[in-house]
């Protein structure tokens, strides 16, 4: 079935080198005694990225990154010194690793490190305007980091930092076991998670957090932590992972006499992620990475995008799950988790639940209670041993919008930009990789919006080593995407439209919600602009509708390439046809010579298909003819090449190859009426090479062509070296090549 | 007032076992952190166990894992100190101390002590 | 031997100042942990004298002062009187094995 193409692969897949040359990338490749570029803050008003690494911290101009300042933040020697005595690693954990960079004013941020495990936090003056240039260090003013960024370079913080108070998830201590969520800064004590019950916290790794409001009134503002940790026994058996989401109010300022200084108002429950299995036994992905808000007109409901991995060694996937803050409300508002002792299971709270419930802000609108302070001894004893809910949160339609589990890969990071196409709004998913690569993923609705289609647009390498991506900032304003690293940072801009063809049905295939067919090429795609003039379906890549006024004998405005070959009876041959999309799918027809009607190639010994074209072994006079490969996608055909093989029986061969170089053949001239001078000496060569008994391997081969060359050039001074460089790339790709666009160019395989 | 009473020490020979228990009175027992801290003769304090308020978390010095056990009665406001397997060493005096969490960055200290119970391991 | 070191002893005449040291490492003191300073009158249960590296609980005189840098902690008595005559430990956090740490002790005498 032709019909259905292959949905889960990238539909264009760009190496590094690709994304280099067609200029749709900017790398800053790090300095040489810095690294982990892990901490991002992007500023649109300034136009500034501002990055966190290892003793550094820079501003980046998000118009070209290679544009940047830097501040240089390591510790004394002293320091470095008294890490390395507590025998760590003086390169990857004696130093000062940015874990905190937040807006502090409208003049300063403030930074917090690991200072070679004794954090340090510093405020970083950033001026009035962007056009003040100021970007550095308040030398004057260090604080205590601890309780904001971790000891331990290696431990993940979640923060952020709202009306001068600094909310934190990190490890407080040196071993990096007291876990907790903070809030510093400002004027009133540090507030934190209790200590020392596991089920609060055990064992967190945070991931994000995020201020919502819960109505118009400030007072019931809340902050949501975003982590994963190790599921509390009885809840699961053995050793599970568990995705959260925590909350905690803004203005929660401890209990009175019991949690004295410690949060009333936290609350957590589960974020499942999970694919129905069989026999009930569902495919969960639960180790959370990483978090996106989804802000869009109501910004007291977000829509939360989620990337999880599998806990297995064994089985390894990645999803992303979408939350609705209206089903994460309504858990919160249900039963609490409790048990009656360690070796009994967790169970819904039947019992009475105290006024007003515990988790909920005190505030005018839920109840009379100025401050957590005035809580009843009821609800803070409740509130201090019920700290889960017993309901997990669901994602939209019970299911991930995007599922990756063949791969060599796993998602890391993710943003999202929502983006306005000619039929409807689109939320494009760019989804960072465990091997440095970046994946743009739309996501479409099919019968109902809740039903969704992953449309896997592009899998761009944005490093040119495999590396974590570990930060991800997406501005709509220079429409770019930064991506970090321990290697480094990379901009990308969020479309690049002519890359997916110069037709029609090629920019309506892709359905990229950026990208409309303008009328003579795939451009970026306004909402403003005049409707008529167009071409764009997301919702069904359908180019026989949109693009069929512009059809010509080919559907898409184009006549094929075409080619001719000659194969040696008896030899192998190869076609080749590999189309610029990866989800087409290719089939071949065969045409006899003088014969109109066309069968399609069916497989066999004789006849191997790859995703390259089309390999014919022992050629017979019989495959002489017409090979025309056509791409079908989304319904869609394409002839992309016509291939005449004439196939030369084996005495005809004979006669040329014992033919001198310059000799007159009328058989060689019969056979070369198509070709240009410089074509005929390595169509020589390609003969001697597929039907030579002596010449075992090509690289012999080529070592005489190059030979033979160089004597020639050195008797020759005019010559103009075209063959030997031909040789020569068709050696390069034989090394492992991931050609991506139409090639039919190369010698020698086709003429 | 807050008041710790330590009871239980005695004379007991190596090997033997022995019960300390603290009454607490004065406060919400339930809301805090409980320790038993060791001063042998003439020596220097010694942490020898802590429980959280729910025991959810317990926690032993190296010196006394695997033979003592720490536990609490929130409704009798009682914390206790089983001894077992007991040494020469382990002869002092026993405090049942109460973590007050008093600074800013929850860093436990002993905000109210007991008078203390002798324990002494002789044959 | 005890993880935070102290002076076995220190002396000074009565309405003298007079200061203990506590020396720790990079895994407590050095780690930003906080330090806490406790008396022991002689035949009685420890008192908390300083806590947070500087605060006095209520009742204890302002002649009682503590502060901290890097991986060592000072408690500083001033106009020293003969009922400050005791065994003063220091005690800081240390994470697990061992949970908390103290100080040797050192025996303060007023001449």
């Known amino acids: 079935n032709y019909q259905n193409g292959k949905n889960n692969v990238p539909r264009l897949k760009l190496s590094y080198k690709e994304m280099l040359e067609s200029n749709n990338v900017i790398t800053f490749n790090g300095l040489a005694n810095s690294s982990s570029y892990h901490t991002f803050l992007l500023d649109e008003e300034r136009s500034r990225l501002y990055v966190g690494a290892k003793d550094h911290i820079f501003s980046f101009d998000l118009v070209n990154i290679k544009d940047f300042q830097k501040i240089v933040w390591p510790v004394s020697y002293t320091r470095r010194d008294e890490c390395k005595w507590a025998g760590k690693d003086i390169l990857k954990e004696c130093a000062n690793f940015i874990k905190v960079l937040k807006a502090y004013n409208q003049t300063h941020l403030y930074a917090c490190g690991t200072g070679a495990f004794h954090p340090i936090c510093t405020y970083i003056e950033i001026g009035h305007h962007p056009e003040d240039n100021i970007f550095k260090l308040e030398n004057s003013h260090f604080e205590n980091g601890r309780g904001k960024s971790p000891y331990d370079p290696k431990l993940l913080t979640a923060s952020l930092l709202i009306d001068g108070e600094l909310y934190s998830g990190t490890a407080a201590d040196f071993m990096g076991r007291d876990f907790a969520i903070f809030r510093t800064l400002g004027h009133h004590h540090p507030i934190r998670t209790e200590q020392h019950d596991s089920r609060w916290l055990n064992d967190p790794k945070f991931i994000s957090a995020h201020l919502i409001s819960e109505s118009d009134n400030p007072e019931d503002d809340k902050v949501y932590f975003f982590f994963r940790e190790n599921a509390i026994d009885g809840e699961h058996s053995g050793k599970a992972t568990h995705a959260r989401i925590g909350q905690i109010c803004k203005n929660d300022f401890g209990g009175h006499r019991s949690l004295v200084n410690k949060w009333t108002t936290f609350l957590k429950a589960r974020l499942i992620c999970s694919v129905p299995g069989p026999n009930g036994i569902d495919t969960h992905f639960d180790e959370l990475q990483d978090v996106f808000l989804m802000n869009f007109k109501d910004p007291k409901n977000p829509v939360v995008y989620g990337v999880f991995t599998t806990s297995s060694n064994i089985f390894k996937g990645s999803a992303v799950c979408m939350y609705s803050m209206s089903d994460v409300r309504r858990v919160f508002l249900g039963p609490y988790a409790h048990r009656d002792g360690p070796n009994y299971q967790w169970v819904p709270y039947q019992g009475r639940v105290p006024y007003p419930r515990p988790g909920t802000c005190p505030s005018k609108t839920f109840g009379g209670f100025d401050s957590t302070k005035d809580l009843p001894d009821d609800v803070i004893t409740f509130a201090r041993s019920h700290p889960a809910m017993y309901n997990p949160v669901f994602p939209m339609n019970n299911r991930p919008i995007v599922i990756k589990t063949d791969v060599n890969y796993q998602f890391t990071q993710i943003v999202v930009d929502r983006v306005d196409a000619e039929d409807g709004q689109y939320d494009v998913m760019f989804i960072g990789t465990d091997v440095g690569t970046v994946l743009k993923v739309v996501s479409i609705p099919k019968e109902t919006w809740y039903d969704l289609e992953e449309v896997l647009l592009e899998e761009m390498t944005v490093f040119r080593e495999p590396t974590a991506i570990s930060a991800m900032e997406l501005s709509t304003k220079q429409q770019q995407l930064y991506i970090g690293s321990t290697a480094g940072v990379a901009q990308l801009p969020l479309h690049r439209c002519d890359i997916y063809g110069k037709a029609c049905a090629e920019c309506c295939l892709a359905r990229d919600p950026y990208c409309a067919w303008d009328g003579s090429a795939c451009s970026r795609y306004f909402p403003t602009a005049k409707r008529r003039t167009r071409r764009q379906d997301i919702r069904n890549g359908d180019p026989l509708t949109h693009c069929s006024d512009l059809h010509h004998d080919n559907h898409h405005g184009h006549s094929p390439e075409e080619r001719i070959i000659y194969g040696v009876e008896n030899s192998s041959t190869f076609l080749e046809c590999s189309p610029k999309s990866q989800r087409a799918l290719v089939y071949w027809q065969f045409q006899r010579r003088n014969e109109e009607r066309k069968e399609e190639i069916r497989v066999d010994d004789h006849i191997i298909r790859t995703d390259q074209g089309l390999l014919l072994r022992s050629l017979q006079q019989k495959d002489s003819g017409n090979y025309l490969c056509h791409a079908v996608e989304h319904g869609f055909i394409q002839t992309l090449l016509k291939v005449t093989l004439e196939v030369i029986d084996t005495e005809h061969l004979e006669e040329l190859l014992h033919k001198d170089d310059d000799g007159d053949g009328s058989k060689t001239k019969e056979m070369s009426n198509s070709m240009t001078p410089s074509q005929k000496v390595w169509y020589r060569d390609f003969m001697q090479l597929i039907n030579h008994p002596n010449l075992n391997t090509m690289d012999e081969f080529c070592e005489q062509v190059w030979k033979r060359d160089r004597k020639q050039r050195r008797q020759r001074p005019g010559h103009t070296p075209g063959n030997s460089n031909k040789w020569k790339h068709l050696q390069e790709n034989k090394k492992g090549r991931n050609r991506r666009t139409h090639e039919f160019e190369r010698a020698p395989r086709s003429v | 007032e807050v008041q710790l009473l330590e009871s239980g020490g005695g004379l007991v020979q190596p090997g033997g076992s022995l019960r300390l228990s603290c009454a607490a009175s004065?406060?919400?027992?339930?809301?805090?952190?409980m320790n038993w801290v060791r001063q042998a003769p003439g020596k220097g304090l010694e942490w020898v166990s802590g429980i959280s308020w729910n025991s959810g978390w317990i926690d032993y010095a190296d010196s006394v894992k695997g033979r003592f056990t720490i536990s609490r009665d929130n409704s009798k406001n009682t914390l206790y100190l089983q001894m077992n397997s007991l040494r020469a060493e382990d002869t002092a005096v026993y405090y049942c101390a109460r973590s007050g969490y008093s600074s800013s960055w929850f860093d436990p200290d002993f905000d109210y002590w007991g008078q203390g119970t002798l324990v002494t391991v002789s044959s | 031997q005890s993880v935070l070191t102290q002076p076995p002893s220190v002396s000074g005449a009565p309405g003298q100042r007079v200061t203990i040291s506590c020396t720790g490492s990079s895994s407590n003191i050095g780690a930003g942990y906080d330090v806490h300073w406790y008396q022991q009158l002689p035949g009685t249960a420890p008192k908390l004298l300083i806590y947070?590296?500087?605060n006095r609980p209520s009742g204890v005189p302002d002649r009682f002062s503590g502060s901290k840098s890097g991986t060592s902690a000072s408690l500083a008595i001033t106009g020293l009187q003969a009922e400050d005559e005791a065994d003063y430990y220091c005690q800081s956090y240390a994470g697990p094995n061992p949970y908390v740490v103290f100080g040797g002790g050192t025996k303060l005498t007023v001449l």
């Open positions: 004065g406060f919400t027992f339930d809301s805090y952190e």
């Open positions: 947070g590296n500087s």
